[in-house]
Amino acid sequence: NQDLPVIKCVLINHKNNDSSVGKSSSYPMVSESPEDLGCALRPQSSGTVYEAAAVEVDVSASITLQVLVDAPGNISCLWVFKHSSLNCQPHFDLQNRGVVSMVILKMTETQAGEYLLFIQSEATNYTILFTVSIRNTLLYTLRRPYFRKMENQDALVCISESVPEPIVEWVLCDSQGESCKEESPAVVKKEEKVLHELFGTDIRCCARNELGRECTRLFTIDLNQTPQTTLPQLFLKVGEPLWIRCKAVHVNHGFGLTWELENKALEEGNYFEMSTYSTNRTMIRILFAFVSSVARNDTGYYTCSSSKHPSQSALVTIVEKGFINATNSSEDYEIDQYEEFCFSVRFKAYPQIRCTWTFSRKSFPCEQKGLDNGYSISKFCNHKHQPGEYIFHAENDDAQFTKMFTLNIRRKPQVLAEASASQASCFSDGYPLPSWTWKKCSDKSPNCTEEITEGVWNRKANRKVFGQWVSSSTLNMSEAIKGFLVKCCAYNSLGTSCETILLNSPGPFPFIQDNIS
């Protein structure tokens, strides 16, 4: 049938906040560029059926399935999904093509399946078939990138075996230290797998997909830099590739570099050299030491020597399993209300950890910084002076680590009171934990100085709200105090706070708060 229209099917992904089920209309949302679904006539099908490429959608994502029909005259249409008919409102675009849309907001399992669009034009009838499924993110992985030498070329290939396929980029920096932070103007990013320019100061490769971003730094010894006070250490797991770059700059080409492992020269095929002249006509040489798949016997001191520079070494440690080394004993801190303070955890780990800080069931992003001694540190300063229990959790492919912190904020007590027919209770969250006194106000003691000692029950640290201790004191009612005003006072080294309660028959109780410094 050669009178068939030319049709185009597209998928539009939306960034939206709305929630609803399928709407067969155009819906105003921020959209990404349409993806052609390659709708093509199904061969030899009974009736005229066009079929679109399978559509995989993330849970809760919003999409539009759109059909553009290049056919003369009017068209009418009907969507069918799981034997239910859905309304269809075609319209015409500026090129006079018929446009039919199906919006799926907040994708759920119930919205996955086959969407059939029946179109009737003046010339013919036809069906368009869309298969929509939820993307199985359980199969997703994001693996740390590693390096391989490109065959027959002096270049490195960056590989990350991840699903979905990640975008791989090289992150290059020619400055030192802080200026090589990710968003610094000194940092250059190249979105490609192969890198030929291997002379830079700092070279990292990063891979990113829907799960996030993982980076690997090219371990470098720079013979022109003053050696670190502690020997640099590189950890690898059995089977992983080893790459160490030795770099040296000299006024002319009259120098050479060599690698040794435990005072034995590396075998040929385990190193390659590159050299170039820099802008000021000095010679830069780099010598790579590499092992495509390390074994336990590749552990040791790798020393890079030069005929014109002092040699430098790195300790390479090959482990069977990843690890996280840190002290997991819980730590308690006591700070003033306006004192600057950060929690910190110092650890040594391989592979690099993923971590979170948690307080009050809420997770906070975790930043980690490498120290010169091979350790890393993670700090958390965003506690907003809220007392309680803070948890640091770290994990990598092979190990997990949790550390608890308690933060106490020194402040004078604040008292809350409640009363029933048989007792009155006062609560305070001040720190240090307060002590309690109860006083009776009467004609004899208008200033409420008459102390009550009987029927008082103090419970220190009664309930723990996300690690925040609350102290309470309860007064059991007796005939002697019924109908009187009583005052409960909580005091610690920072001050005193009181609350006055009228003990009468059951009913609403008036509370009068006193703050006594």
């Epitope: 093509a40 006539l41 199904r42 061969p43």
Partner: antibody, heavy 120, light 107 residues
Framework: EVQLLESGGGLVQPGGSLRLSCAPS????????MAWVRQAPGKGLEWVSS????????YYRDSVKGRFTISRDNSKNTLYLQMNSLRAEDTAVYYC?????????????WGQGTMVTVSS | DIQMTQSPSSLSASVGDRVTITCRAS??????LAWYQQKPGKVPKLLIY???SLHSGVPSRFSGSGSGTDFTLTISSLQPEDVATYFC?????????FGQGTKLEIK
């Protein structure tokens, strides 16, 4: 990254049998139609057979009907081609190809191929 | 079966030239046509589908046109990496059939 890896090729005598397998990765196998396409040495491409994403519908070229069977196991992520009563003219590199759509009739990804030689 | 005939069977052109390869179907196939590129020793690669839709990642110098029985693949400015054999394929009806191929070389 979409990858298709064929296996099972080899040398077989006329009248013999072979079973080709194709292991896909990097995509949701059960969403795509799959096919086998062959290429005799120094010759052009020849479609052999296709199978729908769900496995229900299969299609064959006339010269292999009754001798070849295409099948898939979506739980194992594998495509198969069972070839019986092989003839000399079946000698070719057999490519596993992913269809762009659930029925799969034009092909956006191809495997590296596996060589089938039918000779006495 | 629908026969697909490509012409020419081979051609030689210079870098920068505009190159055209044609494919004729023995009966009308609407727009059910794909074009593939196969470099020496490599596997086929999809270039065009639905006669004129460029597959993602394919350089824009490639384009397809035609409908019914006559189809064309055009390379607007030939590059050295375009040396390959080009195949058309119809998917209007089973059995799916390919053209015999056009071998493209650089002068």
């Amino acid at each position: 990254e979409v990858q298709l890896l064929e296996s099972g090729g080899g040398l077989v005598q006329p009248g013999g049998s072979l079973r080709l397998s194709c292991a896909p990765s990097g995509f949701t196998f059960s969403n795509y139609g799959m096919a086998w396409v062959r290429q005799a040495p120094g010759k052009g491409l020849e479609w052999v057979s296709s199978i729908h994403s769900g496995g229900g519908d299969t299609y064959y070229r006339d010269s292999v009907k009754g001798r070849f069977t295409i099948s898939r196991d979506n739980s194992k992520n594998t495509l198969y081609l069972q070839m019986n009563s092989l003839r000399a003219e079946d000698t070719a590199v057999y490519y596993c190809a992913r269809g762009r759509t659930p029925t799969g009739y034009y092909f956006d990804h191809w495997g590296q191929g596996t060589m089938v030689t039918v000779s006495s | 079966d629908i026969q697909m005939t490509q012409s020419p069977s081979s051609l030689s052109a210079s870098v920068g030239d505009r190159v055209t390869i044609t494919c004729r179907a023995s009966e009308g196939i609407h727009n059910g046509l794909a074009w593939y590129q196969q470099k020496p020793g490599k596997v086929p690669k999809l270039l065009i589908y639905n006669a004129n839709s460029l597959h993602s990642g394919v350089p824009s110098r490639f384009s397809g046109s035609g409908s019914g029985t006559d189809f064309t693949l055009t390379i607007s400015s030939l590059q050295p990496e375009d040396v390959a054999t080009y195949f058309c394929q119809q998917y209007y009806d089973y059995p799916l059939t390919f053209g015999q191929g056009t071998k493209l070389e650089i002068k």
